[in-house]
């Protein structure tokens, strides 16, 4: 199995986070993905999810999270504005395949947030709000109610691990200030 | 322990050309995305090319454009460059590169770089 | 493409100082920033990622702030061993470096 790795972000309250899920492999292009947190102990809990069939290109909206899937990029974009405290913890993506179980997309995501801003100057506790308006185009979407409980603690299987970074170069042309997408690296 | 170890650097005359491999290890190279950046004697770093896990999005510099092929071998774990019509102003240390996870914008890991020079 | 300009190209400082570094970019992009330090004959080493999550094993003295267009890197407290180049990189489109900021003694 693919060892499960974490990657760690360290937020203030009122940040946004802001990161990509890779799915690459086109045969997912238009499968339903989820964002989920995982509470220790507990099975992962859906919190937001793109339309079924994933729309291209399409922001998603559920509170203050904003999915947007990416179909040419192989990339999820997940945002979660006004970050509050509790929303410190362990998030994934994954993807909807029913009937099977749903595929866990690595890495997952190790969110932190403290209380307070940094005060530093160029830092974005200040303009978060003002650079993230939620789109006014957002859908917001009906998820599924069963979740694998698999992905509590298991590795996807090897065959399913790739899913790296689609590396690249979106056409930035018709897309608005808040619909950049980040692809790289 | 993830390790990154380019080869096939070396001299070559204006319009020649050269292919260079990147071998990995310690890791499960069929999940990454995998770059070359380049570093001119005394300059800045510059991304050169990247390639997707499965081969299917593959994106280059205009500096290199048509000229360089990025490529890679799951199986072999290995990623390759292959440059043609090289120029004086590709003379750089090439590195193969990876990044931390999948949703992270810093490349982690490098390899230790393998110098290209073209001269005459 | 994204364009990074990184200032000042270089700096002397003391060991104790507070040295600050700034990546400006040429359009808004996010959070997706990454800081390196490269010391000669060394590939970069990732310092921070996504503007300000400290990558693991680097000393809390570093840190990064910052979003959309303007970015800093803070060394708090200069040690000897940070006497080196740093460089920023955006990952919005295809990944571009600043043009790096060497720091030396003074």
């Known amino acids: 199995a693919t060892k499960l790795t974490e990657e760690k972000y360290e937020l203030k309250e009122g940040q946004t986070l802001d990161v990509k899920c890779d799915y690459t492999l086109e045969k997912f292009a238009s499968s339903q993905k989820a964002w989920q947190i995982i509470r220790d102990g507990e099975m992962p809990k859906t919190l937001a999810c793109t339309e079924r069939p994933s729309k291209n290109s399409h922001p998603v909206q559920v509170g203050r999270i904003i999915l947007e899937d990416y179909h040419d990029h192989g990339l999820l974009r997940v945002r979660m504005v006004n970050l509050q405290v509790e929303d410190s913890g362990l998030y994934q993506c994954v993807i909807y395949q029913p009937p099977k179980e749903p595929h866990m997309l690595f890495d997952r995501i190790r969110l932190v947030v403290t209380k307070g801003f940094s005060g530093t100057p160029g830092s974005n506790e200040n303009s978060t709000q003002n650079v993230y308006k939620i789109p006014p185009t957002t859908t917001k979407a009906l998820c599924p109610l069963y979740t694998s409980p698999r992905t509590v603690t298991q590795a996807p299987p090897k065959s399913t691990a790739d899913v790296s970074t689609p590396d690249s170069e979106i056409n930035l042309t018709n897309v608005t200030d808040i619909i950049r997408v980040p692809v790289f690296n | 322990e993830v390790q990154l170890v380019e080869s096939g650097g070396g001299l070559v005359k204006p319009g020649g050309s050269l292919r260079l491999s990147c071998a990995a290890s310690?890791?499960?190279?069929?999940?990454?995305?995998m770059n070359w950046v380049r570093q001119a004697p005394g300059k800045g770093l510059e991304w050169v090319s990247s390639i997707s896990s499965s081969s299917n999005y593959i994106y280059y510099a205009d500096s290199v454009k048509g000229r360089f092929t990025i490529s890679r071998d799951n199986a072999k774990n290995s990623l390759y460059l292959q440059m043609n019509s090289l120029r004086a102003e590709d003379t750089a240390v090439y590195y193969c590169a990876r990044r931390g996870g999948s949703s992270s914008t810093g490349l982690l890991y490098w390899g230790q770089g393998t110098l290209v020079t073209v001269s005459s | 493409d994204i364009q990074l300009t990184q200032s000042p190209s270089s700096v002397s400082a003391s060991v104790g100082d507070r040295v600050t570094i700034t990546c400006r970019a040429s359009?808004?992009?996010?959070?997706?920033l990454a800081w390196y330090q490269q010391k000669p004959g060394k590939a970069p080493k990732l310092l921070i990622y996504a503007a300000s999550s400290l990558q693991s094993g680097v000393p809390s003295r570093f840190s990064g702030s910052g979003s959309g267009t303007d970015f800093t890197l803070t060394i708090s407290s200069l040690q000897p061993e940070d006497f080196a180049t740093y460089y920023c990189q955006q990952s919005l489109t295809h990944p571009t470096f600043g043009g790096g900021t060497k720091v030396e003694i003074k």
């Open positions: 310690g890791f499960t190279f069929s999940s990454y995305s």
């Open positions: 359009q808004d992009i996010s959070s997706w």
